[in-house]
């Protein structure tokens, strides 16, 4: 087999709700023909399942083969470098990939103008890959919370707020002129999952009309 290939230095998952991506760092001095083999182990079924024989990218979408993540004990993944007939030792993820590793996001934040106030609606994620019964609110059925950041123009500051426990909120804005921009970061009080700030959604108030911008 000649000289042994070095193993990928690190392998890890980066996941959002039903978007489970395995990443790895390349081996040093890889050639144009170097590719990577990916295998997956489901806890409770103690055998490795080959997922990809030769990926030339440094990530692999494992969502389709980990759809039961939210009802399972989790997964481990491993990756090795392959170059022709040579291959490296496996590098295994350091931690169990479970629901705890999923970064929480919101689908979007909708802002609507009403008589004297802005109504904000937090839309929960609705990934296409998710099975019909596996909604965000069914999996995280209790203790959903949201940190809300509001920025006003004119003005120099962004104001963050204590976590709120509802998906709807109101901003009292009668007579206001300017732009209000909102971001939301979800969490679940009973869990340790990280949350990610949403894209900023803005609404402009004038005396005559309003516009929504991203």
């Amino acid at each position: 087999h000649g000289t042994e290939l070095p193993s990928p230095p690190s392998v890890w998952f980066e996941a959002e709700f039903f978007h489970h991506i395995l990443h790895w760092t390349p081996i040093p001095n890889q050639s144009e023909s170097t590719c990577y083999e990916v295998a997956l182990l489901r806890y409770g079924i103690e055998s490795w399942n080959s997922i990809s024989n030769c990926s030339q990218t440094l990530s692999y979408d494992l969502t389709a083969v980990t759809l039961d993540l939210y009802h399972s004990n989790g997964y481990r993944a491993r990756v090795r470098a392959v170059d022709g007939s040579r291959h490296s030792n496996w590098t295994v993820t350091n931690t169990r990939f479970s629901v705890d590793e999923v970064t929480l996001t919101v689908g979007s934040v909708n802002l609507e103008i009403h008589n004297g106030f802005i109504l904000g609606k937090i839309q929960l994620p609705r990934p296409k890959m998710a099975p019909a019964n596996d909604t965000y609110e069914s999996i995280f059925s209790h203790f959903r919370e949201y940190e809300i950041a509001i920025r006003k123009v004119p003005g120099n500051f962004t104001f963050t707020h204590k976590k709120v426990k509802h998906e709807n909120f109101s901003l009292l804005t009668s007579g206001e002129v300017g732009e209000f921009c909102v971001q939301v970061k979800p969490s679940v009080a009973s869990r340790s999952n990280k949350g990610m700030w949403s894209k900023e959604e803005c609404i402009s108030l004038t005396r005559q009309y309003f516009t929504v911008t991203n």
Epitope: I148, I150, R151, H161, H166, F169, L172, T173, E176, F180
Partner: nanobody
Framework: DVQLVESGGGLVQPGGSLRLSCAAS????????IGWFRQAPGKEREGVSC????????YYADSVKGRFTISRDNAKNTVSLQMNSLKPEDTAVYYC???????????????????WGQGTQVTVSS
């Protein structure tokens, strides 16, 4: 840095009145909503009242409606809370806080994380 300073607290008999003021140094209040919050001993901080930067929107907690009035004087860079018909249960430390807008969730005024004053004590007792 934003510095908010409350004043006007004190000891008052039930049924009496107090006027609290919130002033800012090195910070123009007129761009921002100002909320009044209070914290009684052993209780969580709760929203009392809020006024939008334009003064066109106000919020009052059910417990103070008809008794408290919030107003702002942007020329003097102050926001005031006139408190009438005070009750013993109004006893608390009162804080003002700056916000981009008065935010209400399920009928409750939501506390901002930053830009708070140090508080002024209000005691209602005979």
């Amino acid at each position: 840095d934003v510095q908010l300073v409350e004043s006007g607290g004190g000891l008052v008999q039930p049924g009496g009145s107090l006027r609290l003021s919130c002033a800012a140094s090195d910070f123009t209040l007129d761009y921002y909503a100002i909320g009044w919050f209070r914290q009684a001993p052993g209780k969580e901080r709760e929203g009392v009242s809020c006024i939008s930067s334009s003064g066109g929107s106000t919020y009052y907690a059910d417990s103070v409606k008809g008794r408290f009035t919030i107003s702002r004087d942007n020329a003097k860079n102050t926001v005031s809370l006139q408190m009438n018909s005070l009750k013993p249960e109004d006893t608390a430390v009162y804080y003002c806080a700056a916000d981009a807008a008065c935010m209400v969730v399920a009928g409750t005024l939501i506390l901002p994380d930053d830009y708070w004053g140090q508080g002024t004590q209000v005691t209602v007792s005979s």
